[in-house]
Amino acid sequence: QEPSCTMPSTDVDWNTEFSATCLNFSGRGLSLPLNQSLRASNVLLLDLSGNGLRELPVTFFAHLQKLEVLNLLHNPLSRVDGALAARCDLDLRADCSCALESWHEVRRDNCSGQKPLLCWDTTSFQHNLSAFLEVSCAPGLAPATGSGHHHHHH
């Protein structure tokens, strides 16, 4: 069972230094700052699920050296930045979508001995990402169609 933590009750101030090992910003309608790093040097698990995020500003994650789990479920991601994908020890939780192709490719090319990457469908069922991309994102299919998996229920 994955660890969990409750979300901060106040509005998020990105200048705050967060000391916790777990941060829950799920379902807050957040927009991540483009040129500012999250200050959370202890965080192991960061939950950004259900925030309508399309982009993941690479600077935002730059100083999270201890991060192990990044929960991005229920966000309509258009792409995953290569620098983030290249963090081989980062466990990314995301919805099945063709936007994860870059993540898969970077991991395949840069990370050896990895367990199979997974993605989640709208019923919270796990899929092998490689198999999903092969079936749903083959050349000729519209990008990010993902066989309906890009529709998210919060």
């Epitope: 994955e2 933590c5 916790a20 192991l44 201890k66 192990e68 367990k115």
Partner: antibody
């Protein structure tokens, strides 16, 4: 098999510096997510966390003792060290080192899965 | 610092009885709580992590539950080898902190 073993001087005089060594085997402290903490226990008392060192040499200290503590590691020889300066009788305790593992099949947890047997330190003149 | 308060300080139980140990955090720590068993003259051993995950090799009579501020370790049917001190600890925030322990004795 993962093992940790603490060693220390046994007795140290007040105001002196206490140096402790944790020798471990069965894992590498260069593995991402891995870390080792020092924790102590005074006679009949609870556990007190002192310091932690990460695989990337980042360190964390208990603020109540921070000015007196230094944690370090030698990855190649599989050892972690703790120095406590200006000791007094309140530092008399059993000192443990313990491993914080990285669980690649459900990350984000923090716990100590393996502890050393402990080394007893008495501060006395 | 997060204060972890364990109750009771000690308890005497008979073999086969159900044992419930409590741990209360002074602030919300999510599920970042572990339970450790410490037998006399031994070092602590991990029983439960993440509030409810049983560590490898731990008998299934040990169960952890709770979240936020209230946590429980239950031994469904106490065995003689369970006589020990039990410590809860939180790892949600630094400094990491532990409770004072509960001593489980034989009635």
């Amino acid at each position: 098999q993962v093992t940790l073993k603490e060693s220390g001087p046994g007795t140290v005089q007040p105001s002196q510096t206490l140096s402790l060594t944790c020798s471990f085997s069965g894992f590498s402290l260069s593995t991402s997510g891995m870390g080792v903490s020092w924790i102590r226990q005074s006679s009949g008392k609870g556990l007190e966390w002192l310091a932690h060192i990460y695989w990337d040499d980042d360190k964390r200290y208990n603020p109540s003792l921070k000015s007196r503590l230094t944690i370090s590691k030698d990855t190649s020889s599989n050892q972690v060290f703790l120095r406590i300066t200006s000791v007094d009788t309140a530092d008399t305790a059993t000192y443990y080192c313990a491993r914080r593992p990285r669980d690649f099949y459900g990350g984000g947890h923090w716990y100590f899965d393996v502890w050393g047997a402990g080394t007893t330190v008495t501060v006395s003149s | 610092d997060v204060v972890m308060t364990q109750t009771p300080k000690s308890m005497s139980m008979s073999v086969g009885e159900r044992v419930t140990l409590n741990c209360k955090a002074s602030e919300n720590v999510g599920t970042y709580v572990s339970w450790y068993q410490q037998k006399p003259e031994q070092s602590p051993k991990l029983l439960i992590y993440g509030a409810s995950n049983r560590y490898t090799g731990v008998p299934d009579r040990f169960t952890g539950s709770g979240s936020a501020t209230d946590f429980t370790l239950t031994i469904s049917s106490m065995q003689a080898e369970d006589l020990a001190d039990y410590h809860c600890g939180q790892s949600y925030n630094f400094p990491l902190t532990f409770g004072a322990g509960t001593k489980l004795e034989l009635k």
